[in-house]
């Protein structure tokens, strides 16, 4: 006998996630073809600086990989070029377009991408794995107080449905590798570790694969033991920025602190031609500090709108608690509007114009 009953739980309105990025496009190319991906600006407006990403890693231009703000070309494509491609806004990392690309061994014949002449699980509906919500996969560092629970997720899709496996520090990770075990939910693409301890620190990688390709994501877990310390600032933040005159800029600062942190954004200034005072303390002006209605989340971002040449310079995120202070700095370079910026680095290519 099966019995059923119902109870209700009432929740308040919560933040609604931002709009879904454009529909995932699945594209099939033949070996040796030129892969061309186009990402026009939404609503026809200005594009702003963009970056092209494959399987979570920024694409670096080369003789074979041609990167533009609205277009990506991969010449003489091979099987290794299969994967999930996305075009993102450089500053916000918002996904503007994303594509699942599969490169088949046979050159494409142009018309018959309906797959009638291919094996039964190939064609437009088949393809290498891709992240279903790539914009949610940007955060990679998780700092958690000991004794709490951690969940890593890598939701993905592909055809055939990909499998998922997990590595810790590059090695296969199984339940017997930790006291308390782990909980895997393959249908939720998740790994759960209850009551984490310092020995759980490390790099956790999900590997999602099917016969057409493989994608992976690595998360870093830090388990915080509760000895009081000054705030910890995430490495690499805020990051140096280069912006075009009149554009908008965001600096980010991620603060970890047991005791309630106090966060300030400072801009370094000159007084009578000097950057530091008689005692060696830098001259600064406070741009943003905690107010009655300011949340820590809001304080972790400094937004500069319609930047001018006067906005160029050094910016500092300063975080303090009852134990002490920590600070990280970054530089803003402002370029003239007519100058086209072409910057290639490990994070990919940036265009502004």
């Amino acid at each position: 006998e099966s019995l059923g009953t119902e109870q209700r739980v009432v929740g308040r309105a919560a933040e609604v996630p931002g709009p879904e990025p454009g529909q995932q496009e699945q594209l099939v190319f033949g070996s040796g073809d030129a892969v061309e991906l186009s990402c026009p600006p939404p609503g026809g407006g200005p594009m702003g600086p963009t970056v092209w990403v494959k399987d979570g890693t920024g694409l670096v231009p080369s003789e074979r990989v041609l990167v533009g703000p609205q277009r990506l070309q991969v010449l003489n494509a091979s099987h290794e070029d299969s994967g999930a491609y996305s075009c993102r806004q450089r500053l916000t990392q918002r996904v503007l377009c994303h594509f699942s690309v599969r490169v088949t061994d046979a050159p494409s014949s142009g018309d018959d991408e309906d797959g009638e002449d291919e094996a039964e699980d190939t064609g437009v509906d088949t393809g290498a794995p891709y992240w279903t919500r790539p914009e949610r996969m940007d955060k990679k560092l998780l700092a958690v107080p000991a004794a709490n629970t951690v969940r890593f997720r890598c939701p993905a899709a592909g055809n055939p449905t990909p499998s998922i496996s997990w590595l810790k520090n590059g090695r296969e990770f199984r339940g017997e590798h930790r006291i308390g075990g782990i909980k895997l939910r393959h249908q939720q693409w998740s790994l759960v570790m209850e009551s984490v301890v310092p020995s759980d620190r490390g790099n956790y990688t999900c590997v999602v694969e099917n016969k057409f390709g493989s994608i992976r994501q690595t998360y870093t877990l830090d388990v915080l033991e509760r000895s009081p310390h000054r705030p910890i600032l995430q490495a690499g933040l805020p990051a140096n920025q280069t912006a075009v005159l009149g554009s908008d800029v965001e600096f980010h600062c991620k603060v970890y602190s047991d005791a309630q942190p106090h966060i300030q954004w400072l801009k370094h200034v000159e007084v009578n031609g000097s950057k530091v005072g008689p005692d060696g303390t830098p001259y600064v002006t406070v741009l943003k500090t905690a107010g009655a209605n300011t949340t820590d989340k809001e304080l972790e971002v400094l937004s500069l709108h319609n930047v001018t040449f006067e906005d160029a310079g050094e910016y500092t995120c300063l975080a303090g608690n009852s134990i002490g202070f920590s600070h990280h700095s970054a530089w803003l370079v402002v370029l003239p509007a007519e100058e086209e910026l072409v910057e290639a680095d490990e994070a990919g290519s940036v265009y502004a114009g």
Epitope: V9, G11, A14, R136, V150, F152, R153, S257
Partner: antibody
């Protein structure tokens, strides 16, 4: 063994005050939170509020905001619920519960779970 | 309320008034006792809880299933969402002996 023991309940007149204590043992008090949940006689569970002892951050239900205060003494591994301006509708068994977070980079919320509960202490507000 | 006999399969449902993702826990409470955690994150069995208990659902509709009712399972069961603050409980479902 994880244990939570509430004390301080009793009979109080409307408008009066009472302070409940929750003594914790068997776990790292400063790594997790403490929630207070109450249950009126014959009724369901109602969340009152919670504290994270390491940074003192607190949250409260609307029904008690401004009247109840949660605090913690980490040196004593004890959390407190200070109840002022008590009303008849505050009559209930009050439970404290260890509360841990489920940290997940993929979502924009932290889920909080109450895994160990005390035995409860009865507060009666009556004239 | 629901009533059943030993060995029965019991399903208790919980509906949220808005999307709460999978941030739902289930608790069991016996008369005069404190609640006990059974399930968290909609479907994860808490350590030490018998495997006859299972949870499922996401969004607004959630289910707690007892695959084979045992005498010690007669109790009141509460769902609770923690997607938003304040967390809220369902009104409870009492499982009684038929």
């Amino acid at each position: 063994e994880v244990q939570l023991v509430e004390s301080g309940g009793g009979l109080v007149q409307p408008g009066g005050s009472l302070r409940l204590s929750c003594a914790a043992s068997g776990f790292t008090f400063t790594s997790t939170g403490i929630s207070w949940v109450r249950q009126a006689p014959g009724k369901g569970l109602e969340w009152v509020g919670r504290i994270y002892p390491t940074n003192g951050s607190t949250n409260y239900a609307d029904s008690v905001k401004g009247r109840f205060t949660i605090s913690a003494d980490t040196s004593k591994n004890t959390a407190y619920l200070q109840m002022n301006s008590l009303r008849a509708e505050d009559t209930a068994v009050y439970y404290c519960a260890r509360t841990y977070g489920i940290y997940d980079l993929y979502v924009d919320y932290t889920e909080y779970v109450m895994d160990y509960w005390g035995q409860g202490t009865l507060v009666t507000v009556s004239s | 309320e629901a009533s059943g006999g030993s060995g029965d399969r019991v399903t208790i449902t919980c509906r949220a008034s808005q999307d709460v993702s999978t941030a739902v826990a289930w608790y069991q409470q016996k008369p005069g006792k404190a609640p006990k955690l059974l399930i968290y994150s909609a479907s994860f069995l808490y350590s030490g809880v018998p495997s006859r208990f299972s949870g499922s659902g996401s969004g607004t509709d959630f289910t707690l299933t007892i695959s084979s009712l045992q005498p010690e399972d007669f109790a009141t069961y509460y769902c609770q969402q923690s997607y938003t603050t304040p967390p809220t409980f369902g009104q409870g479902t009492k499982v009684e002996i038929k």
